[in-house]
Amino acid sequence: EPHSLRYNLTVLSWDGSVQSGFLAEVHLDGQPFLRYDRQKCRAKPQGQWAEDVLGNKTWDRETRDLTGNGKDLRMTLAHIKDQKEGLHSLQEIRVCEIHEDNSTRSSQHFYYDGELFLSQNLETEEWTVPQSSRAQTLAMNVRNFLKEDAMKTKTHYHAMHADCLQELRRYLESGVVLRRTVPPMVNVTRSEASEGNITVTCRASSFYPRNIILTWRQDGVSLSHDTQQWGDVLPDGNGTYQTWVATRICRGEEQRFTCYMEHSGNHSTHPVPS
């Protein structure tokens, strides 16, 4: 998977008036990495691993970047004409990626009240607008404002692309993201299902990176895909991931089943508790 940095900013308006402040989260390689703490006017690392990425840096630069982006987004929301009464949101998601072959991707997406209405490839500066008339109107509004705003020139988009990649490279240089391998903790549980059957669940937690094989085996042979249920591989908020796999088996045959786990070149098998 490519390395990625993802900025997610949201600003709100109430009865046509843009609210002060903003919400911001940054994800590094899919993990919650930074959050903007409005009360303390600070970008805050999310967990010890995020602290470790920048070592003894103060997050000053990140705080200023998020503050500036939040200010820009509030100005953009102020220029959206069709704001009806009540609560409305404008969200900007900006993502940049570095792939294994060192190629890069960079994009920006705008959502109004949760609905995507404008996307831009920051490398080619190509805009994409969904077909709906509402999206078309909103997109025209925002694009006109961005064109008017001198800061949003060609140079600005190149800078946004370059800055995101520069930050991503800087975080990767710390080695914390690239080097670390955290083996999963594997836990097998059983619960009653229908008569004569039990559900066995195998949970893997607190592992990094996110690639993992987790499957049930019967007599050492993996069960078919359609006899197992898998959970998504999700961040657990500590810079690591969690997932699960479950299957239904006949009571009394527990000893024939094992949970097989493979992660970062290591593997293990885990029996069903009696």
Partner: antibody, heavy 118, light 107 residues
Framework: QVQLQQPGAELVRPGASVKLSCKAS????????MNWMKQRPGQGLEWIGM????????RLNQKFKDKATLTVDKSSSTAYMQLNSPTSEDSAVYYC???????????WGQGTSVTVSS | DILLTQSPAILSVSPGARVSFSCRAS??????IHWYQQRTNGSPRLLIK???ESISGIPSRFSGSGSGTDFTLSINSVESEDIADYYC?????????FGAGTKLELK
């Protein structure tokens, strides 16, 4: 207008802890970080640490981790710095300063001159 | 810790002259440098933040520049009230650190 009031001077016996105060007025005390600095006579400034009055989150310079304890009293909008086991090396002027934006100090108290002497 | 080296230690100038203070960081600190003025027996006063951003209420004769490791504070026409010590402060790394200061005096 924003004001940070500090007592002018404190005479302290060696080893006897002292608690310096910084009373804030003219702004929302719980919305800004409060920083503390040390300045020895004829010398530059040293950053001791900072505290956020909303929840007392503290960040200390490791050099002062055993020397200084930062606290706040929200009800009186006052920040405190306790100097533990003072020695003659701790004789200095101590300033409190409010942070305006990230890590920039826009309002400073007048400073408290601490003399450690028996 | 980041070491901030200010030079010269003392600057002697005539009123009306342009003067520049230097601050060099031991590591790249982006533009996370701030400048303070401290008059005799007074408290420090913020002059410039983030290398070049002006502060409300500070006379326009004060300006700042630089990024990375080399920073400059300039006064384009020195007045007698500018006689003071000048300190730079970095905010890119813990702990926050100050330079040793430059004393400005009149010839």
């Amino acid at each position: 207008q924003v004001q940070l009031q500090q007592p002018g001077a404190e005479l302290v016996r060696p080893g006897a802890s002292v608690k310096l105060s910084c009373k804030a007025s003219g702004y929302s005390f719980t919305s800004y970080w409060m920083n503390w600095m040390k300045q020895r006579p004829g010398q530059g400034l040293e950053w001791i640490g900072m505290i956020h009055p909303s929840d007392s989150e503290t960040r200390l310079n490791q050099k002062f981790k055993d020397k200084a304890t930062l606290t706040v009293d929200k009800s009186s909008s006052t920040a405190y710095m306790q100097l533990n086991s003072p020695t003659s090396e701790d004789s200095a002027v101590y300033y409190c300063a409010r942070e305006m934006g990230p890590y920039t100090l826009d309002y400073w108290g007048q400073g408290t001159s601490v003399t450690v002497s028996s | 810790d980041i070491l901030l080296t200010q030079s010269p230690a003392i600057l002697s100038v005539s009123p009306g002259a342009r003067v520049s203070f230097s601050c060099r960081a031991s590591q790249n600190i982006d533009t996370s440098i701030h400048w303070y003025q401290q008059r005799t027996n007074g408290s420090p006063r913020l002059l410039i933040k983030y290398a070049s951003e002006s502060i409300s209420g500070i006379p326009s004769r004060f300006s700042g520049s630089g990024s990375g490791t080399d920073f400059t504070l300039s006064i384009n026409s020195v007045e007698s009230e500018d006689i003071a010590d000048y300190y730079c402060q970095q905010s890119n790394y813990w702990p926050l650190t100050f330079g040793a200061g430059t004393k400005l005096e009149l010839k």
